[in-house]
Amino acid sequence: EKDAFLVMRNLKVLSLKDNNVTAVPTTLPPNLLELYLYNNIIKKIQENDFNNLNELQVLDLSGNCPRCYNVPYPCTPCENNSPLQIHDNAFNSLTELKVLRLHSNSLQHVPPTWFKNMRNLQELDLSQNYLAREIEEAKFLHFLPNLVELDFSFNYELQVYHASITLPHSLSSLENLKILRVKGYVFKELKNSSLSVLHK
């Protein structure tokens, strides 16, 4: 129901995971710190969906428009395997966000503009999308100077067997990065140069 959560002034954590939620609830309490919307049927994130959530620290949108290829559980993708649509300005208000999970959203691209106000982000999960090409450049990483943990796992292209792994040059700008996960990147050999961007 509209405004259902607005009266909950002291609500800090809201989990609506594994439901049939079709859109981000309107008028969420502004003091919310954590919002879990994973495994729902949201198809589009609108410009103002998170507008008042200036204190939000954790946002999990995983499993909306999931990547269903080869998964060992029941899975329904969005029509034509289309990605979760995210407005360019949807994350503008999330200046305090520390954790963003976009696991299995069928994303093909990650626009830098999503992160222009997200300077405090420490953990980004982009696993199980269609980001094999994006990972080779990943310009958006320039916008995330404080990232500590990054997950690119299981973004392999279907029926493609890469000769080697190509990590983006932009990774070298992540001075605080401690954990990089790239499981399920299908390639033949690890070259001497493959991990050069991680050398400090």
Epitope: E47, D88, Q108, H109, T113, H142, F143, S173
Partner: antibody, heavy 125, light 107 residues
Framework: EVKLVESGGGLVQPGGSLRLSCTTS????????MEWVRQPPGKRLEWIAA??????????EYSASVKGRFIVSRDTSQNILYLQMNALRAEDTAIYYC????????????????WGAGTTVTVSS | DIVMTQSHKFMSTSVGDRVSITCKAS??????VAWYQQKPGQSPKLLIY???TRHTGVPDRFTGSGSGTDYTLTISSVQAEDLALYYC?????????FGGGTKLEIK
């Protein structure tokens, strides 16, 4: 060939209004962010307004210097971008350029790969 | 707003010379810098974005470099047709902002 052609500039008195047009061709207009950038005489380029693409609901964004006075809009059937300028001031005197955002798979880049030739607006009594 | 400063308003060079035009941002813009060329009586033309990526059709004598707050556009061998104004622009945050321009003059 991608083309942007501005029109509608001219001399206007302070407090007056003017509507600029930018006629576009050679690309899918609704797929791109479109911008207005101006250049006052002898000064630096200044971004003033954006009309987002269809994927981003054709919403708009403005610089602080024109917010509340200027309105950017588009006619997607004719592929025309507009800039309605109200409450004009002497400091609005400039060449006004229409520019296309370079685009990153349907998202903005905030750098501009195609520019029109510009149209001159003079605000003076 | 992020302020972009081009300290040299004018630079004089000769055909065949190497020239570097500099630009400083008021804060770290994480390589999100574009360069434009504006010839007399013309509109700006995109040369470089993301500090070092050459736009389609731009001659390879134009190269961009830099990080943090300091950025450079280098023309390795200046040609007569390079006489123009050169602007830097940050595309790190909105509003996008431009430098004041550097006018390249040919001796």
């Amino acid at each position: 060939e991608v083309k942007l052609v501005e029109s509608g500039g001219g001399l206007v008195q302070p407090g007056g209004s003017l509507r600029l047009s930018c006629t576009t061709s050679g690309f899918t207009f609704s797929d791109f962010y479109m911008e207005w950038v101006r250049q006052p005489p002898g000064k630096r380029l200044e971004w003033i307004a954006a009309s987002r693409n269809k994927r981003n609901d054709h919403t708009t964004e403005y610089s602080a210097s024109v917010k509340g006075r200027f309105i950017v809009s588009r006619d997607t059937s004719q592929n025309i971008l507009y800039l309605q300028m109200n409450a004009l001031r002497a400091e609005d005197t400039a060449i006004y350029y229409c520019a296309r955002d370079a685009d990153y798979y349907g998202s903005s880049t905030w750098y501009f790969d195609v520019w029109g030739a510009g149209t001159t607006v003079t605000v003076s009594s | 707003d992020i302020v972009m400063t081009q300290s040299h308003k004018f630079m004089s060079t000769s055909v065949g010379d190497r020239v570097s035009i500099t630009c400083k941002a008021s804060q770290d813009v994480r390589t999100a810098v574009a360069w434009y060329q504006q010839k007399p009586g013309q509109s700006p033309k995109l040369l470089i974005y993301w500090a070092s990526t050459r736009h389609t059709g731009v001659p390879d004598r134009f190269t961009g470099s830099g990080s943090g707050t300091d950025y450079t556009l280098t023309i390795s061998s200046v040609q007569a047709e390079d006489l123009a104004l050169y602007y830097c622009q940050q595309h790190y945050n909105t509003p996008p902002t431009f430098g004041g321009g550097t006018k390249l003059e040919i001796k």
